[in-house]
């Protein structure tokens, strides 16, 4: 019954960018402005996303698809189809209920979004510090202290090759 | 339908003050968390205060201590008093709704008015 109910539906036949208009005997009419449509067989039009203030238009709304926004520039998308503009900060710097502000010492932050984020702990891995981190970049972790004792194997690139017979003292 | 109409812009000296109001109708103004941003010709938008329902604010540290945002919910209006204007604050002022109440943060539902002008000169 409902398969066959369907298939009598006039509105079934409203195409992408019309409406089933029950004020005109379910004539198709289009989608007004500022409205859309994106499938057939629909009984209203929804209204346009407007991209005010911070966001920009990408895509124009059209009969059949709504408009797509993205941000203004200093700012970045949050969220699926940009449904938020947040600010840039700098690198080595987050967004806080404040606004932008420094890292912690002991954390970074090298992209303009995002929280910062504490430096690599060496020790863990029982590795060194081979270069400091900063407030934009992480610690680079070299080798363990005890690879760095004499004849032991490091991960420093390889000293020029011997004469064979001479090992390193 | 909800709007936001700005008035109050308008050429000042170096020094001078202006008051903006932000007329709200069509929503339940006394609810809502308010902002005021600008964009400067060429440099983008950026933040400049916010006010919460219950009356706290919070600034922009380039306008610390010379704007003050407030608000009326009887008149549901939002100001920005504006003193010691610089050259810098030229801009055009938005007032906007502020639902995600985190600085430097707008949603796709939020409201913008159209704008009013700032000019600084000597």
């Known amino acids: 019954f409902e398969r066959t109910r369907s298939l009598q539906d006039p509105c079934s036949n409203c195409p992408a960018g019309t409406f089933c208009d029950n004020n005109r005997n379910q004539i198709c009419s289009p989608c007004p402005p500022n409205s859309f449509s994106s499938a057939g067989g629909q009984r209203t039009c929804d209204i346009c996303r407007q991209c005010k203030g911070v966001f920009r238009t990408r895509k124009e709304c059209s009969s059949t698809s709504n408009a797509e926004c993205d941000c203004t520039p200093g700012f970045h998308c949050l969220g699926a189809g940009c449904s938020m503009c947040e600010q840039d900060c700098k690198q080595g710097q987050e967004l806080t209920k404040k606004g932008c502000k420094d890292c912690c010492f002991g954390t970074f932050n090298d992209q303009k979004r995002g929280i910062c984020r504490p430096w690599t702990n060496c020790s863990l891995d029982g590795k060194s510090v081979l270069v400091n981190g900063t407030k934009e970049r992480d610690v680079v972790c070299g080798p363990s202290p005890a690879d760095l004792s004499p004849g032991a194997s490091s991960v420093t690139p390889p000293a020029p090759a011997r004469e064979p017979g001479h090992s390193p003292q | 339908a909800v709007q936001l109409v700005e008035s109050g812009g308008g050429l000042v000296q170096p020094g001078g003050s202006l008051r903006l109001s932000c007329a709200a109708s069509g929503f339940t103004f006394s609810s809502y968390a308010m902002s005021w941003a600008r964009q400067v010709p060429g440099k983008g938008f950026e933040w400049v205060a916010y006010?919460?329902?219950?009356?706290?604010?919070y600034y922009a540290d380039s306008v610390k201590g010379r704007f003050t945002i407030s608000r009326d919910n009887a008149k549901d209006t939002v100001y920005l008093h504006m003193n010691s204007l610089k050259f810098e604050d030229m801009a055009v002022y938005y007032c906007?709704?502020?639902?995600?109440?985190?600085?430097?943060?707008?949603?796709?539902?939020?409201?913008w008015g159209q704008g009013t002008q700032v000019t600084v000169s000597s």
């Open positions: 906007a709704t502020w639902r995600s109440q985190q600085v430097g943060r707008w949603d796709e539902y939020d409201h």
């Open positions: 006010i919460y329902s219950d009356g706290s604010t």
